[in-house]
């Protein structure tokens, strides 16, 4: 026969734990229901009555199943120089992120502690990995046959155009120049951009910084500033 399903509140068997979305109330010595995200415990359970839950008030939230007496306060409104990427709701705190072109170099409990400008890759270098909300751009030298002639935090290395007759060969920072006869194949005009991520939350491990024009954030590391990478522009 199937075991009888116990309804909360119930006394757990000795040595066993309460089920998912239940908690053990020390006072009542019973397994009781947790409140769902967006709610909090208005009245704790007793031996004869289950937890009474109530909705979080405005500007407060609970993100997890819980039995807290009061919901958590949402963080203060995003300052004018930050972007609200997640609003305060009954189930989630607001999230403020750095303005476009900047990333969070140092975080704190309530959000970002220090925003820093995204590294810009210099001519001859393209974006190997785009910046996210919490990680800087990684630049790489343009491989033979490719170039970047911009200082940008979004442009990747583009292939040289292929000429019937080359007037000036391309290099890492300049496209090939063809003679007046048209090239057999040319790339679409304009720089190739990598889209700026809006809500990437992952923190990448940073390889050694490549040449760039953005200021180094190495001052944030415990070991102190390191010398600029070869070919990078100093402050």
């Amino acid at each position: 026969l199937p075991a009888q399903v116990a309804f909360t509140p119930y006394a757990p068997e000795p040595g066993s734990t309460c089920r998912l979305r239940e908690y053990y109330d020390q006072t009542a010595q019973m397994c009781c229901s947790k409140c769902s995200p967006g709610q909090h415990a208005k009245v704790f359970c007793t031996k004869t009555s289950d937890t009474v839950c109530d909705s979080c008030e405005d500007s407060t939230y609970t993100q997890l199943w819980n039995w807290v007496p009061e919901c958590l306060s949402c963080g203060s409104r995003c300052s004018s120089d930050q972007v609200e990427t997640q609003a305060c709701t009954r189930e989630q705190n607001r999230i403020c992120t750095c303005r476009p072109g900047w990333y969070c170099a140092l975080s704190k409990q309530e959000g970002c502690r220090l925003c820093a400008p995204l590294r810009k890759c210099r001519p001859g270098f393209g974006v190997a990995r785009p910046g996210t909300e919490t990680s800087d751009v990684v630049c790489k030298p343009c491989a033979p046959g490719t170039f970047s002639n911009t200082t940008s935090s979004t442009d990747i290395c583009r292939p040289h155009q292929i000429c019937n007759v080359v007037a000036i060969p391309g290099n890492a920072s300049m496209d090939a120049v063809c003679t007046s006869t048209s090239p057999t194949r040319s790339m679409a005009p304009g720089a190739v951009h990598l889209p700026q991520p809006v809500s990437t939350r992952s923190q990448h491990t940073q390889p050694t910084p490549e040449p760039s024009t953005a200021p180094s954030t190495s001052f944030l590391l415990p070991m102190g500033p390191s010398p600029p990478a070869e070919g990078s522009t100093g402050d």
Epitope: S79, D81, E110, L114, A214
Partner: antibody
Framework: QVQLVQSGPEVKKPGASVKVSCKAS????????INWVRQAPGQGLEWMGW????????KYAEKFQGRVTLTVDTSSSTAYMELSSLRSEDTATYFC????????????WGQGTLVTVSS | DIQMTQSPSSLSASVGDRVTITCKAS??????VAWYQQKPGQSPKLLIY???TRHTGVPSRFSGSGSGTDYTLTISSLQPEDVATYYC?????????FGGGTKLEIK
């Protein structure tokens, strides 16, 4: 309202140390970085360093590295700036200033503390 | 470190005049520029951040503009209470650095 109140003026001899305090009120002290900026008489403003009260994490300007120590006492919401091996050129008004958010500009300043170094 | 070169170092103007103070950064600072007003014997007061955003409570006669390396603070109609030294500051990179200041007097 948000306020930073600094300790009174100090007169010190060359080679001595000075410790200036900055008491915060009207906001959550541990949530905002406190910076120290100095101004020599008739001169411009010079950033010295910062401290994050929640973790005690510090960063100093290269010029002051090894001579300046920033600390906090979270129980009294007070930040301290200690400058050692004083010389006459350290005669200046020292300001504490708060970062309003994650960018390095200062929205609230203390009234300043004049430190005079003279033999 | 990024250098901020402010000009002029001092200027004298009449009440009602339009006053312009300029600041040049040694490299592109992407509008990460703040302006402060410091009256004699007082601490600096934030006027403008992000080159053109007025701080809370700052009168509308104060405005900021600029991009790249060149930034300007403008007082559209000078008032007697505007007598002060004005400083620009970049916060694009650490350490934050200030201009040398512009001392503004009334003629």
């Amino acid at each position: 309202q948000v306020q930073l109140v600094q300790s009174g003026p100090e007169v010190k001899k060359p080679g001595a140390s000075v410790k200036v305090s900055c008491k915060a009120s009207g906001y959550s002290f541990t949530s905002y970085d406190i910076n120290w900026v100095r101004q020599a008489p008739g001169q411009g403003l010079e950033w010295m360093g910062w401290i994050y009260p929640r973790e005690g994490d510090t960063k100093y300007a290269e010029k002051f590295q090894g001579r300046v120590t920033l600390t906090v006492d979270t129980s009294s919401s007070t930040a301290y700036m200690e400058l050692s091996s004083l010389r006459s050129e350290d005669t200046a008004t020292y300001f504490c200033a708060r970062l309003t958010g994650p960018y390095w500009y200062f929205d609230v300043w203390g009234q300043g503390t004049l430190v005079t170094v003279s033999s | 470190d990024i250098q901020m070169t402010q000009s002029p170092s001092s200027l004298s103007a009449s009440v009602g005049d339009r006053v312009t103070i300029t600041c040049k950064a040694s490299q592109d600072v992407d509008t990460a520029v703040a302006w402060y007003q410091q009256k004699p014997g007082q601490s600096p007061k934030l006027l403008i951040y992000w080159a053109s955003t007025r701080h809370t409570g700052v009168p509308s006669r104060f405005s900021g503009s600029g991009s790249g390396t060149d930034y300007t603070l403008t007082i559209s109609s000078l008032q007697p209470e505007d007598v002060a030294t004005y400083y620009c500051q970049q916060y694009y990179s650490v350490p934050p650095t200030f201009g040398g200041g512009t001392k503004l007097e009334i003629k």
